[in-house]
């Protein structure tokens, strides 16, 4: 719609607005083409109007006082149906002495600016100009409800018309509709519905799965208490007034249930002792996921079948399973829970850890001097199978030779078969320190504790071996 604009008023002819063929109207109950509306006038016909009067202080050349200025009476209350048209007006007679008067329309205390359909017409006479300000709305909406007034400024005085109340009636209008909810099975819950006119009153009927719940209507607002549901239901409310009925949106009330299992599990990464997994959660059962459980069991048929359980938050659907054996096969299942309970476990998936470097050093390292061949013999026990973390490919031997002012480290690689090695004496009258590490394709494990043996000068005899005790042997 166009908004009303203030119009400057000039005495005398006014191009484009003077309608000489138009008899000045002091009130227009309704324009032709509009549906007649009910009208009420707040004042009795013929009663002199006393409100909103401005008595101008200006006098003419003869100093004759001017009559008080006031808007003439018009219709006080218009009731009409939504989408109909309406036209109403204010009229006033202004002595021609006044220049630059402006007239404006106001609604509920706010000036109507912009593109409203407001027309001001001027009907000049010798001494006064009759002004009729018309306001029309082609298709009224509820937002047009309110109190409309005209204001005129004259000599810094403000003249205000009586209000014209516009009441737009129509089908009930919802101010609060029921909301979708997720509820616990057999637990009571409330739904609220509120609708307004005009016209009032507005009565509410509740509908569940297309059937009316209440035989007698309730006055708006209405709260429906549902004692509990065992299955999903759709609720709506009907709002009735004298103009007809309006039906709210249908809302689905879901019953909270245990979630569905995840729909996907991905193996993102594997190391010797960990597996990183992610998952896509299944249907949440109309209740937010709280946490998830990752179940892990060794896939080896000879294992004892015990299940490791790792609990984690529901987000971010990612978990690193740790403390796993290297080079082992695992079955993994994922389950998630909401407030109702746990989902079934996802189908079991297979994942393997990779080969790692051994986690312990060789045991029982023994070193002795074979003086006849000028060699050092070394013996050891391989690490326990479970701590090899892969397939042994050999051993790395570090031997450090120290004598006065000299230190020399050498590394030897030994194949996986056997558990002994022989190294040549590098320096006499020196200490040889030996350490051994197991090697897999996953890397080099930790070195054993150092074992020292003294290599005498040529001619000395010392066959006593040096060794590191095996675990448990003091």
């Amino acid at each position: 719609r166009e908004e009303a604009k203030p119009y400057p008023l000039f005495p005398g002819p006014f191009p484009g607005s003077l309608q000489t063929d138009h008899t000045p109207l002091l009130s227009l109950p309704h324009a032709s083409g509009y549906q007649p509306a009910l009208m009420f006038s707040p004042t009795q016909p013929g009663r002199p109007h006393t409100g909103n009067v401005a008595i101008p202080q200006v006098t003419s050349v003869e100093s004759k006082p001017l009559p008080p200025l006031a808007f003439k009476h018009t219709v006080g209350h218009i009731i009409l149906s939504e989408h109909k048209g309406v036209k109403f007006n204010c009229s006033i007679s202004v002595p021609n002495i006044y220049q630059d008067t402006t007239i404006s329309w106001w609604k509920d205390g706010k000036e109507l600016l912009g593109a409203h359909h407001a027309i001001t017409q001027f009907y000049p006479d010798d001494e006064v100009t009759a002004i009729i300000a018309s306001f029309s709305i082609t298709s009224v909406q509820r937002s047009d409800n309110g109190s409309y007034i005209c204001k005129m400024k004259i000599n810094n005085e403000e003249i205000v018309s009586d209000p014209i109340y516009i009441e737009v009636q129509g089908l009930p209008h919802f101010t609060k509709q029921p909301e979708s909810m997720n509820v616990t099975r057999n637990t009571a819950f409330n739904l609220t519905c509120q609708a307004v006119g005009p016209p009032e009153p507005v009565n509410i009927f509740w509908v569940q799965n297309s059937s009316r719940v209440n035989e007698q209507p309730e006055k708006s607002p209405s709260v429906l208490t549902v004692p509990g549901l065992t299955e999903m239901a759709v609720f709506s409310c009907e709002a009735h007034n004298d103009k007809g009925l309006t039906v709210s949106k249908g809302v689905q009330i879901n019953i909270k249930a245990i979630p569905s299992p995840p729909t996907e599990v991905s193996i993102r990464n594997s190391t010797a002792h960990s597996i990183l997994i992610s998952w896509v959660p299944g249907f949440d059962g109309y209740s937010p996921f709280r946490n998830c459980s990752i179940q892990v069991k060794e896939a080896d048929p000879l294992s004892n079948g015990s299940v490791m359980i790792f609990n984690t938050s529901a987000l971010p659907h990612l978990y690193q399973i740790k403390q796993l054996q290297a080079l082992a096969n695992y079955s993994i299942g994922v389950s998630c829970m909401n407030e109702i309970g746990w989902s079934a476990v996802s189908p079991w998936i297979l994942a393997s850890t990779t080969e790692g470097a051994p986690s312990v050093a060789p045991l029982n390292v023994t070193v002795f001097l074979n003086e006849s061949s000028d060699n050092v013999d070394i013996r050891w026990m391989k690490p326990p199978t479970k701590q090899q973390d892969g397939e042994l490919v050999g051993y790395r031997i570090s031997h450090v030779w120290q004598s006065a002012g000299i230190s020399k480290e050498l590394l030897e690689e030994v194949g996986q078969n056997g558990s002994r090695a022989r190294i040549s004496v590098q320096v006499h009258n020196a200490t040889c320190t030996v350490r051994i590490a197991a090697v897999t394709r996953g890397g080099v494990g930790p070195f054993s504790d150092p074992v020292k043996i003294f290599i005498p000068a040529h001619g000395w005899v010392d066959y006593a071996p040096s060794s590191t005790p095996a675990p448990g042997n003091a």
Epitope: P261, P262, T263, E264, I267, N269
Partner: antibody, heavy 128, light 111 residues
Framework: EQQLVESGGGLIQPGGSLRLSCAVS????????MSWVRQAPGKGLEWIGI???????YSASWAKGRFTISKDSSKNTLYLQMNSLRAEDTAVYFC??????????????????????WGQGTLVTVSS | DAQLTQSPSTLSASVGDRVTITCQSS????????LSWYQQKPGKPPKLLIY???DLASGVPSRFSGSGSGTEFTLTISSLQPDDFATYYC???????????FGGGTKVEIK
């Protein structure tokens, strides 16, 4: 109600291209992997490929290069783009929801557990 | 590529009969049990009957059962009903391979 509806089938000349669509309702493509399967007249079922919930795709070896699976999660629609069509591609094409899927990201493959919801299928006829 | 072989390819039976269909895989199915059975009627899409070799899908009558592990699987209909005349397919996946293999199908027809 959970439903799959295929469309886009029809008569196409050899060498031509066609894009099939599968409209999904009642569940979200962003939470489920989806698959395409075809069935030549009077023959058995033949798996074409899969797209995971995250958009990773895996195809049967015979379909690689000619058939491409994609999806638009905002429209909840699955697609099968078929190029260089041959007479032996004449079949009813089904889209199906993957009930569960395991992905091995590091090795670029994935395994279907089951196909638990199927569309009615759309017939593609390749003929001159 | 791995293959699933169903036998027999056609089976004639009467209402009330006990029917058994076998499915043999050329290599072990993933996790030894990721094998499913589907039922298809003419002009209709397949319908999931059994997954994990022996778990009944939702809404499937208990007269259907599945068994097996690794490479040998069986679908059994304990007492054939008129609604069961259809074609049955086994299908499964394999480690290290994305392909989802279908068996050639077994048509169960009225004797």
């Amino acid at each position: 109600e959970q439903q799959l509806v295929e469309s886009g089938g029809g008569l196409i000349q050899p060498g031509g291209s066609l894009r099939l669509s599968c409209a999904v309702s009642g569940f979200s493509l962003s939470s489920n992997a989806m698959s395409w399967v075809r069935q030549a007249p009077g023959k058995g079922l033949e798996w074409i490929g899969i797209i995971s919930s995250s958009g990773s795709t895996y195809s049967a070896s015979w379909a690689k290069g000619r058939f491409t699976i994609s999806k638009d999660s905002s429209k909840n629609t699955l697609y099968l783009q078929m190029n260089s069509l041959r007479a032996e591609d004449t079949a009813v094409y089904f889209c199906a929801r993957v009930g569960f899927f395991v992905g091995y990201g590091a090795y670029d493959y994935g395994i279907i557990h089951r196909l638990d919801l199927w569309g009615q299928g759309t017939l593609v006829t390749v003929s001159s | 590529d791995a293959q699933l072989t169903q036998s027999p390819s056609t089976l004639s039976a009467s209402v009330g009969d006990r029917v058994t269909i076998t499915c043999q895989s050329s290599k072990s199915i993933y996790n030894n049990n990721w094998l499913s059975w589907y039922q298809q009627k003419p002009g209709k899409p397949p319908k999931l009957l059994i997954y994990d070799a022996s778990d009944l899908a939702s809404g499937v009558p208990s007269r259907f059962s599945g068994s097996g592990s690794g490479t040998e699987f069986t679908l059994t209909i304990s007492s054939l009903q008129p609604d069961d005349f259809a074609t049955y397919y086994c299908a499964g996946g394999y480690s290290g391979d994305s392909d989802y293999a279908f068996g050639g199908g077994t048509k169960v027809e009225i004797k």
